[in-house]
């Protein structure tokens, strides 16, 4: 047999279904099976109840992505195997990972005061996460536009040159991945 | 089916060590961290480590710390809970129990009661 | 450690009772919280996982609330099956309550 189609890496949040796609070709037709970080992988197959599921394309389907904070079953590189009594067949490998978002920012920003015509900075460095967390800005719960001339966001410091009175406000840091978002303690500037 | 089946009862005397096995079937082994927790009579549930079977690593309370050990061997897929210098308050049913994704044991073997008696 | 405190330690009820166990956290453990059921000579069931998620195979009439330091565990209309010890669990770090017993009145 030989396979046609790979399967490729893929990143998922927890809870999300996801396919972990393989296709393969001979005579006899080959049966398929999936293996984790060298061991065999159970699906309905073998247990109806199973989160996975092995789709008459060979294609492994997970209902939904089990993840804990220990044990994480489906997290690892996988590879799917094309048998037939001819011989068998070993796909690429592909790594399936597990998105996330941690709760607790690495650094939340403080209050500042500063003042008029002097520059601002407020400095966040978001909550661990996979993919890496981007953040943006929110003054008084309303997203900051970095097209501002007076504005940059760089990291993840904002940085305001040239303050006056109306920047004076509630500032949140806000972290996000394709997981969701994390709001950072707020802090005023003076 | 996802079971797991643990080895049998076990009379020791104060001082000596006793080793319980638990065999996982039905799932990855390697992908769902195992726990140990004992029962003595008539009392409640007795959190005593966990072990993460892909790696070896392990966890244990103060309490155990220096008398449990935690193994396991992939290619039979069991994990083992080696208890040593046993007094006769270690009398208990021990378990094993897997942890699933959501952070809860949702399966637990049948139990190995162990009697330490002179 | 995480102390968990369940109450009562013990309660009788009748068939068709509602019944209510607390488990308080000694800290917070947001949702880290776990139920289950144990009948004599028998290793625990899983009932509720993350404080208020129904295990597969687990009827209805179970139903798990609270987040935090204070949690539930409520049986809606209790069953003659249900007559069982119960133990919360948190899974912050993991340590069990001291368990409930339920006996028929």
């Known amino acids: 047999p030989r396979i046609v189609e790979h399967p490729s890496d893929v990143i998922v949040s927890k809870g999300e279904p996801t396919t972990l796609n393989c296709k393969a070709e001979g005579r006899p037709t080959p049966t398929i099976e999936w293996y984790k970080d060298g061991e065999r992988v159970e699906t309905d197959k073998d247990d109806p109840r199973s989160h996975r599921m092995l789709l008459p394309s060979g294609s492994l389907f997970f209902l939904r992505i089990v993840h804990g904070r220990r044990s994480k079953p489906d997290e690892g590189s996988y590879v799917c195997v094309a048998r037939n009594y001819l011989g068998e067949a070993v796909s690429r490998n592909a790594s399936l990972e597990v998105a996330l978002l941690r709760d607790d920012f690495r650094q939340n920003p403080t209050d500042v005061v500063v003042a008029a015509g002097e520059p601002a900075i407020l400095e966040c460095q978001p909550p661990r996460g996979h993919p890496e967390p981007t953040i943006y800005w929110k003054k008084d719960k309303v997203r900051i536009d970095d097209k501002e001339e007076r504005i940059s966001i760089r990291g993840g410091k904002l940085m305001i040159s040239n303050t006056r009175k109306s920047d004076a406000g509630m500032y949140t840091c806000v972290g996000t991945n394709m997981v969701g978002e994390r709001d950072s303690d707020p802090a005023e500037l003076t | 089916e996802v079971q797991l089946v643990q080895s049998g009862a076990e009379v020791k005397k104060p001082g000596a060590s006793v080793k319980v096995s638990c065999k996982a079937s039905?799932?990855?082994?390697?992908?769902?961290?195992m726990h140990w927790v004992r029962q003595a009579p008539g009392q409640g549930l007795e959190w005593m480590g966990w072990i993460n079977p892909k790696n070896g690593d392990t966890e244990f309370p103060q309490k155990f710390q220096g008398r449990v050990t935690m193994t396991r061997d992939t290619s039979i897929t069991t994990a083992y809970m080696d208890l040593s210098r046993l007094r006769s308050d270690d009398t208990a049913v021990y378990y094993c129990?897997?942890?699933?994704?959501?952070?809860?044991?949702?399966?637990w073997g049948q139990g190995t009661m162990v009697t330490v008696s002179s | 450690d995480i102390v968990m405190t369940q109450s009562p330690s013990s309660l009788s009820a009748s068939v068709g009772d509602r019944v209510t166990i607390t488990c308080r956290a000694s800290?917070?453990?947001?949702?880290?919280l776990n139920w289950y059921q144990q009948k004599p000579g028998k290793a625990p069931k899983l009932l509720i996982y993350a404080a208020s998620s129904l295990q597969s195979g687990v009827p209805s009439r179970f139903s798990g609330s609270g987040s935090g330091t204070d949690f539930t565990l409520t049986i809606s209309s209790l069953q003659p099956e249900d007559f069982a010890t119960y133990y919360c669990?948190?899974?912050?770090?993991?340590?069990f309550g001291g368990g409930t017993k339920v006996e028929i009145k």
């Open positions: 129990a897997r942890e699933s994704g959501d952070d809860a044991f949702d399966i």
């Open positions: 039905g799932y990855t082994f390697t992908g769902y961290y």
């Open positions: 669990q948190q899974s912050y770090s993991t340590s």
């Open positions: 800290q917070s453990i947001s949702s880290y």
